[in-house]
Interface confidence: low
């Protein structure tokens, strides 16, 4: 491998000791709590509720719940935690994914069940974009082997 | 309560540095994009730098660029700018302030005036 | 570099009456998020700045309902629907899009 290859993985290590994913583990698994307990346990259910989360074209805001505003101040500070700590690895698409994949790997074993799961990933792969960050392309969220794809 | 506390500005000869301060408290300093913005009286507010949570990613306006520094000590809750070659056309109040953790600038502190004169 | 464009760049008032403020960009402002990354603060004299609006459209906890943002892509508006004493100073907006860039201001002043 070529040397710059291999400086860039130490520095993405380093990058990644350094950083603290449990804001963003905390915010994901409120967030689809939040989601079952507006959905029932089947996160698919469609709602013909106008402003259900899945209308609500806030849900969709990188700054929703606002820190601006008190109503769930819990998960807006754990997003806004999360989404400073994603912003280390901004101008590294490959370590961003690493990101993703650590806190998926943290989480995966207190996911309750394969639809939990996918819901999970599902908001996983959207939290870069949710702050305001580019995602990253290729991203292989899958915990089951350790012979995943990093790019 | 949020206090943004900046020091370090004074008079300055052309070509000379100096280091601005700002100290924090009654926030997560460390959870917080920081910002120095600057206001002069012709040119109004002009975002000067900002660093990020950590420190990894720093972004510098075009007309500093290669000239001033931002840094932030994490222990000490302080951030830093490190003004070098410094022009006429620098002299200003210079605020920082705490992002709200996307990109609004949410807290600012009450500036430091720094004059570059001859 | 994007940059944003103010005007008026001075805007007499008379309390009670609406004041209106326009920011143009000179490249769209749409995140791919969907959301445009322009914010209004106002610097009262003596004082430092205060965010008064962010995305363009969403109001900073504790400025008053009369303040209000509107806008999309390249052009953008601040209004306030009934200006008071204590809203002169100079208004600004700011793009967050790539880095940061602030307008020239608008001077806003009773009659």
């Known amino acids: 491998r070529q040397q710059w290859e291999l400086q860039g993985d130490r520095r993405c290590q380093s990058q990644l000791e350094r950083a603290n994913l449990r804001p963003c583990e905390q915010h994901l698994m409120q967030k689809i709590q939040r989601d079952e307990d507006s959905y029932g346990r089947d996160p698919y259910s469609p709602s013909q509720d106008p402003y259900s989360p899945s209308q609500d074209p806030d849900r969709r805001d990188p700054y929703s719940p606002s820190p601006y505003d008190r109503r769930g101040a819990g998960s807006s500070q754990h997003q806004e935690r999360c989404c400073n700590e994603l912003n280390e690895f901004e101008n590294n698409q490959r370590c961003m994914c690493e990101a993703l994949q650590q806190i998926m790997e943290n989480q995966s074993d207190r996911l309750q069940g394969r639809q939990q799961e996918q819901q999970f990933k599902r908001e996983l792969r959207n939290l870069p974009q949710q702050c305001g960050l580019r995602a990253p392309q290729r991203c292989d969220l899958e915990v089951e082997s350790g012979g995943r794809d990093r790019y | 309560q949020v206090q943004l506390v900046e020091s370090g500005g004074g008079v300055v000869q052309p070509g000379r540095s100096l280091r601005l301060s700002c100290a924090a408290s009654?926030?997560?300093?460390?959870?917080?994009?920081m910002h120095w913005v600057r206001r002069s009286p012709d040119k109004g507010l002009e975002w000067v730098a900002a660093?990020?949570?950590?420190?990894?990613?720093?972004y510098y306006a075009d007309s500093v660029k290669g000239r001033f520094t931002i840094s932030r000590d994490s222990s000490k809750n302080t951030l830093f700018l490190q003004m070098d070659s410094l022009r006429v056309e620098d002299t200003a109040v210079y605020y920082c302030?705490?992002?709200?953790?996307?990109?609004?600038?949410?807290?600012w502190g009450q500036g430091t005036l720094v004059t570059v004169s001859s | 570099e994007i940059v944003l464009t103010q005007s008026p760049l001075s805007l007499p008032v008379t309390p009670g009456e609406p004041a209106s403020i326009s920011c143009r960009s000179s490249?769209?402002?749409?995140?791919?998020?969907?959301?445009?990354?322009l914010d209004w603060y106002l610097q009262k004299p003596g004082q430092s700045p205060q965010l008064l609006i962010y995305?363009?459209?969403k109001r900073a906890s504790g400025v008053p309902d009369r303040f209000s943002g509107s806008g999309s892509g390249t052009e953008f508006t601040l209004k306030i629907s009934r200006v008071e004493a204590e809203d002169v100073g100079i208004y600004y907006c700011?793009?967050?899009?790539?880095?940061?860039?602030f307008g020239q201001g608008t001077k806003v002043e009773v009659n």
């Open positions: 302030a705490r992002d709200s953790g996307y990109r609004s600038l949410l807290h």
């Open positions: 009654g926030i997560a300093f460390n959870d917080y994009t």
């Open positions: 660093i990020s949570y950590g420190g990894t990613n720093k």
């Open positions: 490249q769209s402002l749409v995140h791919r998020n969907g959301y445009n990354y």
């Open positions: 995305m363009a459209s």
């Open positions: 700011m793009q967050a899009l790539q880095t940061w860039t």
